[in-house]
Each structure stands twice: as structure tokens, then as C-alpha cells.
């Protein structure tokens, strides 16, 4: 009998999570499971239960995480790594759209978070949609051209900002930015 | 509880290679932190490297990263120093430990020295140039 299967990991209500707020990890595996194991990668921190509660997010929080479950003297196959990003760190970037805000279906957009400080990473997130579009770009400005918008794109965008180097200490989120597809 | 017995150690010449051993007695190996300290003559003892619980996170003294590497082997209940490269410098005594982690709350990842609570006897590692 191969490895037992993997159990999943989440952070509640998000893996983005401003400084000082709460957030759950919980680790599920299935029923009857004897022991879980909760890590922190790039560390040696662990603990022997299913949920991490985080009354309030600290920057030393922040990173990758995993879980493992034993039965009897089996372990796990390890969980997909979850991100802990801890947000409002640095200070808001602003969002823009170039030409602007409206567009017509069909048309090209380019929506573009900047900074002041020297920043090599930025994340663009719309409101609803589970993952942020990633960009590494020049320092300073980072441009997320949509080619051919359809009404899908219209909603709520925000930007974040941060270091490769912290990966997981990102700025507080740019003012929204409203798309509106005509 | 844990009780910790180092092996591998001896006499080699500059950019040779040793393997050093720890095994460990106690059911709960896999609970633990388990690092690599040294103690020149004369000198304090230094933290050299650690491991997490599952292997999946490793942390070096800046003095040996890129040539030393940890490993660990829980169903064997124990712990690898593959040291490459070796320098006459790195000539001590090598013991192995183990800790507790940290907490989620600490401000530190890794146990500080003074938190590895078992200690083995030590083997000898002498580096000739």
C-alpha cells in the first residue's frame, strides 16, 4: 500500500492578510486521522494540530506552510504549500488604467500599479477571482496590458507591491480601481 | 527523551570529504530539531547546522553553507553531516543535539543554542593540511 494521500491546507478567510488581523490555517485530512503536523518552511516551527489560529498577523508569520497527517506509523504525502502573505507592510501603491478606467469591449487596456519605493514585484488582484496575476517588471512600474476586454474584465481591481527578496511581506493595497467594459 | 551517539569522525586531509552520523534512541526523534555543533580547542562551541522535523527545511552557518549539508533519516532515527571540502579550520570536536522548535509566536525560526536540550559525547574530526 503506496503513501497515504495528501490533505489539503487553507488559510480562512484569505492568505493575504493584513498585519495585525486574524487569520486560521487549517489542515484537513480524512476521518480517524491520529495525528497532524502543521510546518512552517524555511523554519523549524511546527505544531502537532490541524489549525493554526493567528489572532493577530505578524511579520515573522509570514511564508510558506505545509501539512502532513500520521496514521499509525504512516505519514502523509505532504499538503500543497499554502502562501501567508502579510499585507500592510509597505505603504499603498497607486492603480491607474491607461487610456483610462472605461473602455469598450473589444478595445486594449493597460491597468498599471507604481510605487515610490523600489519594488521589483507587484500582484494585481480583481475582486472575486481567487489568484492574483503576478508580475515581475521594472523597478518602479508595473504594467498589466488586457488585450481585447470583454465585459468579464469589468470590476474591482488592486495592486500590491513587495521585494523578491521578502516575497511574502507585501505593501497594504492600492485605492480600488474600477473597470467599467461598455 | 532522547539519548544521541555521533560517529564518523577522523583524520583527513584538506578537500577530503566525511559523513558524520547521529543516531538517536527515543520513539519521538521526529518531534525534534537536530543540529550540528563544534568545539575547536580553545574555542566555544558554534552552531554549525539544523534541520526541521520533516528534512523539508535546512539552516547553515554561514562559515560551512555550501560545503556541509544536513540530512536526517527519521525511520532510522538518524541525522547526517555530509561535510565536503573540509578546511584544517573546521578541525573539532562535532556534536550532535536536539531541540524543540519554536512556537508560532516566537520571533525566530530555529531554536537558539541555548535551547538544544540534548547533547551526544562528541567525535573528533581533525582536518591535516
Known amino acids: 500500500s503506496g503513501p497515504l494521500p495528501k490533505p489539503s491546507l487553507q488559510a480562512l478567510p484569505s492568505s493575504l492578510v493584513p498585519l495585525e488581523k486574524p487569520v486560521t490555517l487549517r489542515c484537513q485530512g480524512p476521518p480517524g486521522v491520529d495525528l497532524y503536523r502543521l510546518e512552517k518552511l524555511s523554519s523549524s516551527r511546527y505544531q502537532d494540530q490541524a489549525v493554526l489560529f493567528i489572532p493577530a498577523m505578524k511579520r515573522s508569520l509570514a511564508g510558506r506552510y505545509r501539512c502532513s497527517y500520521q496514521n499509525g506509523s504512516l505519514w502523509s504525502l505532504p499538503s500543497d504549500q499554502l502562501e501567508l502573505v502579510a499585507t500592510g507592510v509597505f505603504a499603498k501603491p497607486s492603480l491607474s488604467a491607461q487610456p483610462g478606467p472605461a473602455v469598450s469591449s473589444g478595445g486594449d487596456v493597460t491597468l498599471q500599479c507604481q510605487t515610490r519605493y523600489g519594488f521589483d514585484q507587484f500582484a494585481l488582484y480583481k475582486e472575486g477571482d481567487p489568484a492574483p496575476y503576478k508580475n515581475p517588471e521594472r523597478w518602479y512600474r508595473a504594467s498589466f496590458p488586457i488585450i481585447t476586454v470583454t465585459a468579464a474584465h469589468s470590476g474591482t481591481y488592486r495592486c500590491y507591491s513587495f521585494s523578491s527578496r521578502d516575497p511574502y511581506l507585501w505593501s497594504a493595497p492600492s485605492d480600488p480601481l474600477e473597470l467599467v467594459v461598455t | 527523551q532522547v539519548q544521541l551517539q555521533e560517529s564518523g569522525g577522523g583524520l583527513v586531509q584538506a578537500g577530503d570529504s566525511l559523513r558524520l552520523s547521529c543516531a538517536a534512541s527515543?520513539?519521538?526523534?521526529?518531534?525534534?530539531?537536530m543540529g550540528w555543533f563544534r568545539q575547536a580547542p580553545g574555542k566555544e562551541r558554534e552552531f554549525v547546522a539544523a534541520?526541521?522535523?520533516?528534512?523539508?527545511?535546512?539552516y547553515y552557518a554561514d562559515s560551512v553553507k555550501g560545503r556541509f549539508t544536513i540530512s536526517r533519516d527519521n525511520a532510522k532515527n538518524t541525522v547526517y553531516l555530509q561535510m565536503n571540502s573540509l578546511k584544517p579550520e573546521d578541525t573539532a570536536v562535532y556534536y550532535c543535539?536536539?531541540?524543540?522548535?519554536?512556537?508560532?509566536?516566537?520571533?525566530?525560526?530555529?531554536?537558539?543554542?541555548?535551547?538544544?536540550?540534548?547533547w551526544g559525547q562528541g567525535t573528533q574530526v581533525t582536518v591535516s593540511s
Open positions: 543535539a536536539a531541540a524543540d522548535p519554536p512556537s508560532f509566536y516566537s520571533d525566530y525560526d530555529w531554536p537558539r543554542d541555548h535551547e538544544y536540550d540534548y
Open positions: 534541520i526541521s522535523w520533516s528534512g523539508g527545511s535546512t
Open positions: 527515543g520513539r519521538t526523534f521526529s518531534s525534534y530539531v
